[in-house]
């Protein structure tokens, strides 16, 4: 009789589909993730099951709190799709599919500098390239730890380029670039390249 009542409740909106989510949607291989399967009904004792494609990953019982499934994303196929099932007695409902986006982290970019020196100015071209990491990659250029460019998005494996003109400076300047893709909180920086101050013939990057 209880099963019948629960199934009847499901036909109304008292027992909607569960929700499957994760705080992290973009991950890299080897990353640990937590998946949360939750239900609006906080009074029922619910059995939650997690599936990926057509394999069963685990089952947990819960009442009022979401079920938490901890996984490690080590292979491409582990991106999903995932779904969870909420079951009360013989009645069950499924969540919508959830998939992770697996992104390879960017490696430290290489910064190259080319300078055209005139009597009064230096025309500087900065090139930045990260040879590994999922595209697109956003590059930002820095001078003395201050951003001097907007984020430059590259959808192919080609260097980002930024041009600037400087009055011949009296002191040396340090340039570096940052590479970042969709992985949150994961940015890498090039080694700094120092541009010496003007004085004598000290412009190692200059085109003569």
């Amino acid at each position: 009789r209880k099963a019948v009542l629960d199934c009847e409740a499901m036909k109304t909106n008292e027992f909607p589909s569960p929700c499957l989510d994760s705080k992290t949607k973009v991950v890299m291989k080897g990353q640990n993730v937590s998946m949360f399967c939750s239900h609006k009904n906080k009074s029922l004792q619910i059995t939650y099951s997690l599936f990926r494609r057509k394999t069963h990953l685990g089952t947990q019982d819960g009442k009022g709190e979401p079920a938490i499934f901890n996984l490690s994303i080590t292979e491409a196929h582990e991106s999903g799709p995932y779904k969870c099932k909420a079951q009360v007695t013989s009645c069950s409902k499924y969540s919508r599919d959830f998939s992770f986006t697996i992104v390879d982290p960017v490696t430290s970019p290489v910064l190259n500098i080319m300078v055209i020196q005139t009597e009064t100015d230096r025309h500087i071209t900065l090139h930045c390239l990260s040879v590994n990491g999922s595209l697109p990659i956003n590059y930002t250029f820095f001078e003395n730890h201050v951003a001097i460019s907007p984020a430059i998005s590259k959808y192919d494996r080609e260097p980002a380029e930024f041009n600037l003109t400087k009055k011949n400076p009296g002191e040396e300047e340090e340039y570096r670039c940052e590479a970042k893709n969709r992985l949150p909180n994961y940015a890498t920086y090039s080694h700094p390249v120092t541009m010496p101050s003007t004085g004598g013939d000290s412009c190692p990057f200059c085109l003569k």
Partner: antibody
Framework: EVQLVESGGGLVQPGGSLRLSCAAS????????ITWVRQAPGKGLEWIGT???????YYSTWAKGRFTISRDNSKNTVYLQMNSLRAEDTAVYYC?????????????WGQGTLVTVSS | AIQMTQSPSSLSARVGDRVTITCQSS????????LSWYQQKPGKAPKLLIY???RLASGVPSRFSGSGSGTQFTLTISSLQPEDFATYYC????????????FGQGTKVEIK
């Protein structure tokens, strides 16, 4: 080459125990599911149980309690421990591999090993 | 217990015939399509033909096709070839009473 090789079959007395092995080569058991299936002489295929890539095990109702599936990742081998054997357990026992993330799409099969339960 | 009923249990057909085998499940399979079909010849291990109810496994001739959803599934051989005389099994995957699989009892396709 991807293959499965069963071993450990033979003649056993009623009430006895036997452990079958399924040695996998060419792939890792930490990615794929292994399922045991049996076939009595002249009969159809019967699902015994499954161990998935996470080490979770699932059993047919009739196999639960008497049969246990385990694996040794270092040997890349899955085992089927069979206890309290009966005459009706006489069959060819197969292990089979599922597709990635699809436990029961069994695309790689071993050659089978014959278990005979008789006094 | 879940019942997977295959019909017919045997049939006789000629080369070139169109053959249809059905599988009726007592419960819906997981995702409504967690069903596969296998071919087995005497003394040999089974061979996967169809998965996801209708998708052809690698290397399987296109004369084999599958259809159906939920509880009712069909395997069709559009033009029977001499090498197709064998026994065919369906296998369903379920999550209703635990994670569970069940084979149909088999259909033997014989030469008429």
């Amino acid at each position: 080459e991807v293959q499965l090789v069963e071993s450990g079959g033979g003649l056993v007395q009623p009430g006895g125990s036997l452990r079958l092995s399924c040695a996998a080569s060419g792939f890792s058991l930490t990615i794929y599911t292994i399922t045991w299936v049996r076939q009595a002489p002249g009969k159809g295929l019967e699902w015994i149980g499954t161990i998935n890539s996470y080490g979770n095990t699932y059993y047919s109702t009739w196999a639960k309690g008497r049969f246990t599936i385990s694996r040794d990742n270092s040997k890349n081998t899955v085992y089927l421990q069979m206890n309290s054997l009966r005459a009706e357990d006489t069959a060819v026992y197969y292990c089979a591999r599922g597709y990635v993330d699809s436990d029961w799409y069994l695309n790689i099969w071993g050659q089978g090993t014959l278990v005979t339960v008789s006094s | 217990a879940i019942q997977m009923t295959q019909s017919p249990s045997s049939l006789s057909a000629r080369v070139g015939d169109r053959v249809t085998i059905t599988c009726q499940s007592s419960e819906s399979v997981y995702d409504n399509n967690y069903l596969s079909w296998y071919q087995q010849k005497p003394g040999k291990a089974p061979k996967l033909l169809i998965y996801d109810a209708s998708r052809l496994a690698s290397g399987v001739p296109s004369r084999f096709s599958g259809s159906g959803s939920g509880t009712q599934f069909t395997l069709t051989i559009s033009s029977l070839q001499p090498e197709d005389f064998a026994t065919y099994y369906c296998l369903g995957g379920y999550d209703s009473s635990g994670w569970y699989a069940a084979f149909g009892q088999g259909t033997k396709v014989e030469i008429k």
